[in-house]
């Protein structure tokens, strides 16, 4: 379909870089959540930081192109990077409006499929881009 994709947009304080230029922020009449209409893809993404006690959203927005995973109707995150010991970044890509608002499920830390806690470490800002 020719319509453009609309995604939830969020960037946590302190995150380096921005994906704001990948779309047009919409006026939705409410402060949160913000919405962004994608310019270069029909694909949303989300990044969550999972620690022992909670999952915290790091970034949500538009991808810069359509890639494998973008055909998914829902956000099903997979582990991507370790910003620090005991925490794991999970990312999803999906291809329906606002599909990145929340994830369907996250595997518990240390479960099969999650990178081991001795995996590569990265500075907080860098790890976000590794995950993307």
């Amino acid at each position: 379909p020719p319509n453009r994709r609309t995604c939830v947009f969020f960037e946590a304080p302190g995150v380096r870089g921005s994906t704001k230029t990948l779309g047009e922020l919409l006026d939705t009449g409410t402060e949160l959540p913000r919405a962004i209409r994608c310019l270069y893809s029909r694909c949303c993404f989300g990044i969550w930081n999972l620690t022992q006690d909670r999952a915290q959203v790091e970034m949500q927005g538009c991808r810069d192109s359509d890639e494998p995973g973008c055909e998914s109707l829902h956000c099903d995150p997979s582990p991507r990077a370790h910003p620090s010991p005991g925490s794991t970044l999970f990312t999803c890509s999906c291809g329906t409006d606002f599909c990145n608002a929340n994830y369907s499920h996250l595997p518990p830390p240390g479960s099969p499929g999650t990178p081991g806690s001795q995996g590569p470490q990265a500075a907080p800002g860098e790890s976000i881009w590794m995950a993307l």
């Epitope: 609309t6 919409l26 209409r37 310019l39 270069y40 810069d64």
Partner: antibody
């Protein structure tokens, strides 16, 4: 400030391939923006042909998709248009344009391409 | 594709007149209440110049006598007091759906 300048042959023979280049100054084409081609037949309206994005992805007007290719040369900060199998109906002023959003804030001066034998 | 129909196709007006140009889309150009309709001015031998974006936002450097309004399928460009430099052709453009499309233009001539 951001400036765009089209260049290329002003005359192309029917059935041949039209080739134009847009040179961008004052801004890197890999930093941001979509880099578009838009044409205007003499005395007529505007037609968006397609773009190449700052990351290199392309999008084309379906009415031209089988004939149009947009590419870039990042070392020269240029992007290019190729339109194959041209006919007299492709005679137009061709504009390159830069867009941060889905409207066109930055335009080249345009170049007239005539298709004739 | 979304078709944009501008009316009138041409008009004659005098300096100081209030001029209204309309653009009707074949389907809505709104996304979640945001209108993706834009307006340009073009003078002979020159490229189009952005006047209004997203229905009602005045582009930087454009005089405040230009204004835009509308939503859904019906949009208007208004020049509150026509100036000599405003005699030109005006185009609407939608970007709610691919491919981007333009209206056929409205030529504003001197009466």
């Amino acid at each position: 400030q951001l400036q765009l300048q089209e260049s290329g042959p002003g005359l192309v023979k029917p059935s041949e391939t039209l080739s134009l280049t847009c040179t961008v100054s004052g801004y890197s084409i890999t930093s941001d923006f979509a880099w578009n081609w838009i044409r205007q037949p003499p005395g007529k309206g505007l037609e968006w042909m397609g773009y190449i994005s700052f990351s290199g992805s392309t999008s084309y007007n379906p009415s031209l998709k089988s004939r149009v290719t947009i590419s870039r040369d990042t070392s020269k900060n240029q992007f290019s248009l190729k339109l194959s199998s041209v006919t007299a109906a492709d005679t137009a002023v061709y504009y390159c344009a830069g867009s941060r959003y889905s409207w066109f804030a930055y335009w080249g001066q345009g170049t007239l391409v005539t298709v004739s034998s | 594709d979304i078709q944009l129909t501008q009316s009138p196709s041409s008009l004659s007006a005098s300096v100081g007149d209030r001029v209204t140009i309309t653009c009707r889309a074949s389907e809505s150009v709104d996304t979640y209440g945001n209108s993706f309709m834009h307006w340009y001015q073009q003078k002979p031998g020159k490229p189009p110049k952005l006047l209004i974006y997203r229905a009602s936002n005045l582009e930087s450097g454009i005089p405040s006598r230009f204004s835009g309004s509308g939503s859904g399928t019906d949009f208007t460009l208004t020049i509150s007091s026509l100036q000599p430099e405003d005699f030109a052709t005006y185009y609407c453009q939608q970007s709610n759906e691919d491919p981007y499309t333009f209206g056929g233009g409205t030529k504003v001539e001197i009466k």
